[in-house]
């Protein structure tokens, strides 16, 4: 959300989120760093142009046009510099003058070693229960930002895990359309569109970075689970990863695994949609799954196939009209998995990303819970490793990401919700290695054709 | 280059307290965390654990808790290590040595702190 | 925890003599293992990381090999300046843990 110099009366109030670096003479002698050359306080350039139709209420969701809600001034850093006060340096750079270029690897978290494994388990859980550094949250909206009395910024700390997890809800989230009114659910700022791909990306740098400056290791990567093994168990869901089956209760995960104590945050959907609260840093109930034991559905009680992946590939158009879950010939339609394998849109379909999700048959499962299970993360890193292929493949070809007319959110030059400093969706569409500091240790399935007799 | 200057022997009765400095230069002091290694006379090596230098979140390692705090001062490049309440037993060689260049091992290393606790 | 044993304890060689030194873990630190030596009065050093690169400024004569368990540091030719203590690290959960040391004397 903001970072914790700019939850305060005077920045809401003036609208400038510029924090000083290293102020020498006094608060606001070095915003941005500019007294380095890192960077300068300036407006906010946010996505203007119009949205599909499905989003009827303009002026009514502080996510529109963001972040001009909150703020209109914000730190533009210069060369490789990057971060909220310019203060640190863009991905795949780092150096005290973000001169020197850093590629780390993502790996299967089956290829790991023991100590490997390990070293991710524990450094998931200390995310967990470590309070953000740098960022906390809106627990009311704009309107309500600054509390009762107009002089309490309504924020709170939460921990580099639950900042994870709340950006993602606060994506996800209803409008809020007023008390004793339905609230609008026709909206997702990083699902159902072109910003399903570019959104997650960013939302897993974030975290990896988060982590990075924890452990104070800048080699630290995330893995990935490949979940196309076209099998009906969780391969990972074992206790020296990401934990086994309870035997007390088998939606539960078994008390031999750390994350049998990790308690949820946002589950109180209720309350948001019609009080208008926001989720806050409250936690809950404990994580919830069940792999492949949705009886009531068996299309999603087995993985998807590895040939699904490779025919993913295939799809060269990365997106098209109407941009939306309905979308037929879309890369990203079907790697978030509304289409078959093919590209061809199927209401009953539910495939690749959407149905590793609902295999979990739990917490993981609910898009405004998701990440509370940090299966999530995995699940991610293995949809990004299959985008950043097809970046590869096709060049990064984002011609057909619409620069306008896409669900709210969704617009090429759209600021991802709620991330801070903006990003647009175009910042992301670009290979990894080349551009964002990290690569991707795997091999894809070459596609089969079956030669007629 | 990295360098990494530590504060000079002391001699403490048992009960006492000691602080040892670390004072780093060469290199981007917040950057890195900063271990500290304990060597008894005569014997090896034991991690008594880190500080994270952006932060200032310590972890310890199984047996340095309670009488062990790791601080630092960023305006100094200088990371400390206080032991409380000495005991005859916390007589030892006492290192600093940042994550530089890997997280997995240390490559530059402070010249070492004696601390002699005796009645 | 992982523990990591070292032997000998103590090896007697004479100068211009191969030296072998042997480290092995409880269970398997893929190549996360480094090796340093340490003179009396003196900081230890670093000689090799991830089992088997050379750290900047060690001479040729100093290899190192293994992955999993079993690891070993070889001195190919033994020179005055090598007789010391040498350690085995690896890291758990960001602790370092250290073999308990093999001393290098002069026969």
């Known amino acids: 959300q903001f970072p914790r110099q700019c939850a305060t009366v005077e920045a809401l109030r003036s609208g400038m989120c510029c924090p000083d670096l290293s102020p020498v003479s006094g608060p606001g002698t070095d915003r941005c760093g500019s007294s380095s050359g890192r960077g300068r306080c300036e407006a906010v350039t946010a996505d203007s142009r119009p949205h599909s139709p499905q989003y009827p209420h303009d002026g009514r969701d502080d996510r529109e046009v963001w972040p001009l809600r909150f703020f209109n001034r914000t730190c533009h850093c210069n060369g490789n510099f990057s971060g909220h006060n310019c203060g640190t340096c863009r991905p795949g750079w780092r150096g005290a003058a973000c001169d020197q270029r850093v590629l780390i690897v993502r790996r299967n978290l089956l290829d790991l070693s023991k100590e490997e494994k390990n070293h991710f388990v524990r450094a998931l859980d200390m995310a967990k229960r470590t309070t953000h550094p740098l960022f906390v949250i809106a627990t009311r909206r704009s309107e309500e930002i600054l509390g009762p009395d107009g002089n309490t910024p309504q924020f709170e700390n939460i921990s580099i895990y639950n900042y994870f997890v709340w950006t993602h809800y606060y994506s996800v989230k209803k409008t809020f359309l007023g008390v004793g009114q339905e609230s609008f659910g026709e909206v997702d700022f990083s699902h159902e569109g072109p910003a399903f791909l570019t959104w997650h990306r960013y939302h897993l740098l974030r975290l990896e970075k988060d982590m990075q400056e924890m452990l104070q290791e800048p080699s630290f990567s995330l893995p990935y689970w490949n979940f196309a093994t076209g099998k009906n168990v969780c391969d990972i869901c074992t206790d020296d990863l990401m934990g086994s089956r309870s035997n007390f209760d088998s939606t539960l995960i078994s008390p031999n695994s750390v994350f049998s104590q990790w308690r949820v945050v946002c589950d109180s959907l209720e309350d948001y949609d019609t009080l208008g609260t926001l989720c806050n840093s409250t936690e809950d109930g404990p994580i919830r799954r069940n792999p492949a034991g949705n009886v009531a559905r068996p299309m999603v009680q087995r993985l998807p196939e590895p040939q699904d992946v490779a025919q993913c590939l295939e799809v060269g158009l990365f997106d098209t009209p109407p941009f939306y879950s309905n979308s037929t010939n879309s890369f990203r339609n079907t790697v978030e998995g509304y289409s078959d394998p093919t590209g061809k849109y199927d209401p009953a379909v539910r495939s690749l990303h959407n149905l590793a999700h609902l295999f979990l048959n739990g917490t993981g499962g609910q898009t405004h819970l998701s990440p509370n299970d940090p299966i999530f993360v995995l699940l991610h890193t293995f949809t990004d490793a299959v985008f950043d292929e097809w970046l590869r493949r096709y060049n990064a070809d984002i011609s057909t990401f619409p620069l306008e007319n896409a669900p709210i959110g969704h617009n090429r030059q759209y600021n991802m919700v709620p991330f801070w400093p903006p990003v647009t969706n175009t910042e992301m569409f670009v290979t990894a290695p080349d551009n964002l500091g990290y690569t991707y240790e795997i091999q894809w399935p070459s596609r089969e054709f079956s030669v007629p007799e | 280059q990295v360098q990494l200057v530590q504060s000079g022997s002391e001699l403490k009765k048992p009960g006492a307290s000691v602080k040892i400095s670390c004072k780093a230069s060469?290199?981007?002091?917040?950057?890195?965390?900063m271990n500290w290694v304990r060597q008894a006379p005569g014997q090896g090596l034991e991690c008594m654990g880190w500080?994270?230098?952006?932060?200032?979140?310590?972890t310890y390692a199984q047996g340095f808790t309670g009488r062990f705090v790791f601080s630092m001062d960023t305006s100094v490049s200088t990371a400390y290590l206080q032991i409380s309440s000495l005991k005859a037993e916390d007589t030892a060689i006492y290192y600093c040595?940042?994550?530089?260049?890997?997280?997995?091992?240390?490559?530059?290393w402070g010249q070492g702190t004696l601390v002699t606790v005796s009645s | 925890e992982i523990v990591l044993t070292q032997s000998p304890a103590t090896l007697s060689l004479s100068p211009g003599e191969r030296a072998t030194l042997s480290c092995r873990a409880s269970?398997?630190?893929?190549?996360?293992l480094a090796w340093y030596q340490q003179k009396p009065g003196q900081a230890p050093r670093l000689l090799i990381y991830d089992a088997s690169n050379r750290a900047t400024g060690i001479p040729a004569r100093f290899s190192g090999s293994g992955s999993g368990t079993d690891f070993t540091i070889t001195i190919s030719s033994l020179e005055p300046e090598d007789f010391a203590v040498y350690y085995c690290?690896?890291?758990?959960?960001?602790?370092?843990?250290f073999g308990q040391g093999t001393k290098l004397e002069i026969k």
């Open positions: 269970q398997s630190v893929s190549s996360y």
């Open positions: 500080i994270n230098t952006n932060t200032g979140n310590p």
């Open positions: 060469g290199y981007t002091f917040t950057s890195y965390a």
């Open positions: 690290q690896q890291r758990s959960n960001w602790l370092y843990t």
């Open positions: 040595a940042p994550r530089y260049s890997s997280s997995w091992y240390l490559d530059y």
